[in-house]
């Protein structure tokens, strides 16, 4: 039997993530949430503990037991300085137990206090946990990573926090060794180079600068902000637009803690979007006092709103390279991690400063740690793999990709995570009798109906004969090819007339960020989706066979083959059908069964009676 | 003349399975449904569902779905009722009944007592 | 699921009399496109299986006598008995067909 694989875990301040090595590569592995990332989120309620997804969710309801940032507090003393000046900013509340900080909650009506290496090993648990369900057998053994700039006080406290969890803590690894070795950086045997290591994160800002020769790695220098990120993007965006919604509407949203939270989540968004496209909308219903707000923003404003933040980013960047004694021309490789290095002007900023190297970004910025991590985690289990040396990094279909079919169901041809270059084909019909033309909507997304995925674009195939519905035959084709680009072409098989339209990955897409978020919401509604789906699916099955029936009798064909008794009882039944669909749109699943079973007896026996006598 | 003949009374203990069955003559059994009523004693009557003669598929009502199976046997022209792991309050008397644009036609009834 | 309601529980009349038992349902049982309602009535005499007697509402089933009338539309209904005879002691039962099925808890007939 393969022994059990030992896993890398980022833990990190705002989230934390989860990887194995195995089969030759590495995979990140999705929560319970179907989430490649997990916040690092503890909440204490009247009657449970929630870790992760769940604890986030609730935080805007249960602010004062819903305990984040441990990693602020792990290995620090009550009275450092860092300690006092968090405190002021979290509304949960921090005490002094010997000069250790503990966390004071209410938890099933009673008041309890936890240790930081308490809370970080609820989190640790739940990653444990993760990879458990994924793997299908239990894990011990794990690489966790920390900061370069942690002390042994705190790598101690993060190992002790591992213990707590279960697990056997092979090493602590600085989360600039990770992502080096998730890029191979160690392996390349062109002798020592000097990588820097951009981590800009949701709350975090680290600069590292590591000189790695034949496999060992050394931290020259570190430096950073412990508190510039994402957030701090998008509190100038809400700040923006609480501005502009006093200039639009006279009014000020700033107290309301509700709208403020829900234009936040639309600033995240937004944020989100313009890392892949030039603008963003924003449309939040009923914000303030039933007023709508709908409004945008460029890509060159959310810039311009954030230039004194992004441009800060260099003198960490400037005075790591002084500590470590080095020119800007000695670095050899430039490594972006955390989701907010995905800002091109953050990117842009970066690679104007170092005349234009090129960044090493291949991996998901929010995954590279805890992909070395895993890397190493391997290495350190005897993992003899050439892979462990050379990984192979296939592109993927990030998002199922499909067309919308009758009643606003997503029919998907190409299924998220199939691997590019790929071509699928499938054959559709008419929806009504003597329709002429058929509009071809592709979208992509894992919801249900279309309506709660994207559309990339749409094109009208026209000049199909009149014919009955469901007797036409459209042929349907999705083609990716090596770089992305998605080719969708429908031709009407009758007349071999055909349209097409091509789709970029540039123009509209997703982001990678919104691709997870859909991702994560589907893993959510799955289950509803899954009932809607199958609603969705009798229904039209109803439909379909209602239709079919009565153009079969009415079928001038069958003229004197079938009694007018027959006939009559057959239209009736349809007739009765038809209306209660008509008026029934949003019944449940078993209902069209039950319906459609009822009319599959009373016309069954009378169809297959015309065929046997024929 | 159309007729439904059920089986006979049944005494079982809990956990036991009991099959009833219901014949039908008169008539050309695939072309109607064959629906399945319980009456507990002293209580109304509560349709449990139904199964499409032609197709053989069924249809549960909530309340029957899991321990309950309805099946055919066409060329007998008998349907058939299965409930699995008897419970003390599946004692009932259980009707099959046929359904043209109702329930028109309706066999005599069995009588299954569940008791230890 | 729909819901069906019978008023009375019971009721005792003299051989002669007229009786008048009520259904109500939890939805429309209309349907538009036949404009008919899905509504059935079943007598059950003691120690005897149900009867159909009336479907759609109002349309008697052959050999059913016609002092029974079947009466109403959309989610109220009502069963008419004109002169009620000894052997009309029974529960009647209404039943709704508009989707899946459902029985009302009965009406039971008593001839003082």
């Known amino acids: 039997m393969a022994k059990a694989a030992a896993i890398g875990i980022d833990l990190g301040t705002t989230y934390s993530c989860v990887g194995v090595f195995q089969h030759g590569k590495v995979e990140i592995i999705a929560n319970d949430q179907g989430n490649r990332t997990t916040p690092s989120y503890v909440a204490f309620t009247d009657t449970e503990r929630l870790i992760g997804d769940a604890a986030k969710n609730q935080v805007a309801l249960n602010p004062q037991n819903t305990v984040f940032d441990a990693k602020r507090l792990i290995g620090r003393k009550f009275g450092d300085p860092v300690v006092q000046s968090d405190m002021k900013h979290w509304p949960f509340q921090v005490i002094n137990d010997g000069d250790k900080p503990k966390v004071q909650v209410s938890y099933k009506g009673e008041t309890k206090a936890f240790y930081p290496e308490e809370i970080s090993s609820m989190v640790l648990t739940k990653m444990k946990e993760i990879a458990e369900a994924y793997l299908g057998y239990p894990v011990t053994n794990a690489v966790i990573t920390v900061p370069a700039y942690f002390n042994d006080s705190q790598r101690q406290a993060t190992k002790d926090a591992g213990v707590i969890a279960g697990l056997n803590v092979l090493r602590i690894i600085n989360e600039p060794t990770a992502a080096a070795i998730a890029y191979g950086l160690d392996r390349t045997g062109k002798g020592e180079r000097n990588v820097l290591i951009f981590d800009l994160g949701g709350g975090t800002f680290d600069v590292s600068i590591l000189t790695i020769d034949d496999g060992i790695f050394e931290v020259k220098a570190t430096a950073g902000d412990t508190h510039l990120g994402g957030e701090d993007f998008d509190n100038r965006l809400v700040n923006h637009f609480v501005e502009e919604f006093k200039r639009k509407h006279k009014k000020d949203i700033s107290q309301n803690k509700r709208a403020v939270r829900r234009l936040r989540t639309a600033c995240e968004r937004a944020k989100r979007t313009l890392s892949s496209s030039t603008q963003a909308s924003l449309e939040i219903d009923s914000l303030f006092e039933g007023i709508d707000f709908y409004t945008s923003i460029t890509r060159a404003r959310f810039e311009e709103l954030c230039s004194d933040l992004f441009r800060s980013t260099l003198e960490p960047v400037e005075k790591a390279l002084r500590d470590a004694k080095l020119d800007k021309a000695q670095i050899h490789d430039l490594v972006l991690v955390g989701g907010s290095t995905r800002i091109p002007k953050v990117q842009k900023l970066l690679q104007d400063f170092f005349n234009g190297r090129d960044l090493n970004k291949s991996i998901n910025p929010d995954e590279a740690v805890a992909y070395g991590a895993a890397v190493q985690a391997a290495i350190l289990m005897g993992d003899k793999s050439e892979n462990v040396q050379d990984l192979l990094l296939l592109d993927v279909a990030p998002l199922s990709l499909g067309l919308e079919t009758a009643g606003g169901v997503m029919t998907a041809l190409i299924k998220r995570n199939s691997t590019i270059p790929t071509k699928q084909t499938q054959i559709f019909t008419t929806y009504s009798d003597n329709q002429p033309g058929v509009l071809i909507q592709v979208y992509e997304g894992e919801r249900a109906m279309t309506k709660d995925n994207n559309l990339l674009g749409r094109f009208e195939l026209s000049g199909i004969p009149p014919a009955p519905r469901g007797v036409p035959q459209i042929e349907v084709t999705f083609d990716i090819d090596a770089n992305g680009i998605l080719n969708v072409t429908a031709t009407d098989k009758s007349t071999g007339k055909a349209n097409k339209i091509t789709i970029t990955n540039d123009k509209g897409r997703l982001s990678k960020e919104e691709i997870e978020r859909m991702v994560q919401e589907a893993e959510k509604y799955k289950a509803e989706d899954e009932v809607q789906r199958e609603r969705v699916s009798a229904k039209n099955a109803l439909e379909s066979y209602a239709f079919n029936m009565k153009s079969a009798v009415e079928d001038e064909g069958l003229k004197g083959k079938i009694s007018e008794a027959d006939k009559k009882k057959v239209l009736d039944k349809c007739q009765e059908v038809i209306s209660w669909l008509d008026a029934n749109t949003l019944a449940e699943k078993d209902e069209f069964e039950h319906k459609r079973k009822e009319l599959e007896q009373v016309c069954n026996p009378i169809i297959s009676g015309l065929y046997q006598g024929a | 003349q159309i007729q439904l003949v059920q089986s006979g009374p049944e005494l079982k203990k809990p956990g036991e399975t009991v099959k009833i069955s219901c014949k039908a003559s008169g008539y050309t059994f695939t072309n109607y449904g064959m629906n399945w009523v319980k009456q507990a004693p002293g209580k109304g009557l509560k349709w449990m569902g139904w199964i499409n003669t032609y197709t053989g598929e069924p249809t549960y009502a909530d309340d029957f779905k899991g321990r309950f199976a309805f099946s055919l046997e066409t060329s007998a022209t008998t349907a058939y009722l299965q409930i699995n792991n008897l419970k003390n309050e599946d004692t009932a008397t259980y009707f099959c009944?046929?359904?043209?644009?109702?329930?028109?036609?309706w066999g005599q009834g069995t009588s299954v007592t569940v008791s230890s | 699921d729909i819901v069906m309601s019978q008023s009375p529980s019971s009721l005792a009349v003299s051989a002669g009399e007229k009786v008048t038992m009520s259904c109500k349902s939890s939805q429309s049982l209309l349907n538009s496109g036949t404009r008919k309602n899905y509504l059935a009535w079943y007598q059950q005499k003691p120690g005897q299986s149900p009867k159909l007697l009336i479907y759609?509402?109002?349309t008697r089933e052959s050999g059913v006598p016609d002092r029974f009338t079947g009466s109403g539309s959309g989610t109220d209904f009502t069963l008419t008995i004109n002169s009620v005879q000894a052997e009309d002691l029974a529960v009647y039962y209404c039943?709704?067909?508009?989707?899946?099925?459902?029985f009302g808890g009965g009406t039971k007939l008593e001839i003082k």
């Open positions: 009944a046929r359904y043209d644009h109702a329930m028109d036609y």
């Open positions: 039943k709704q067909s508009y989707t899946l099925y459902t």
């Open positions: 759609w509402t109002s």
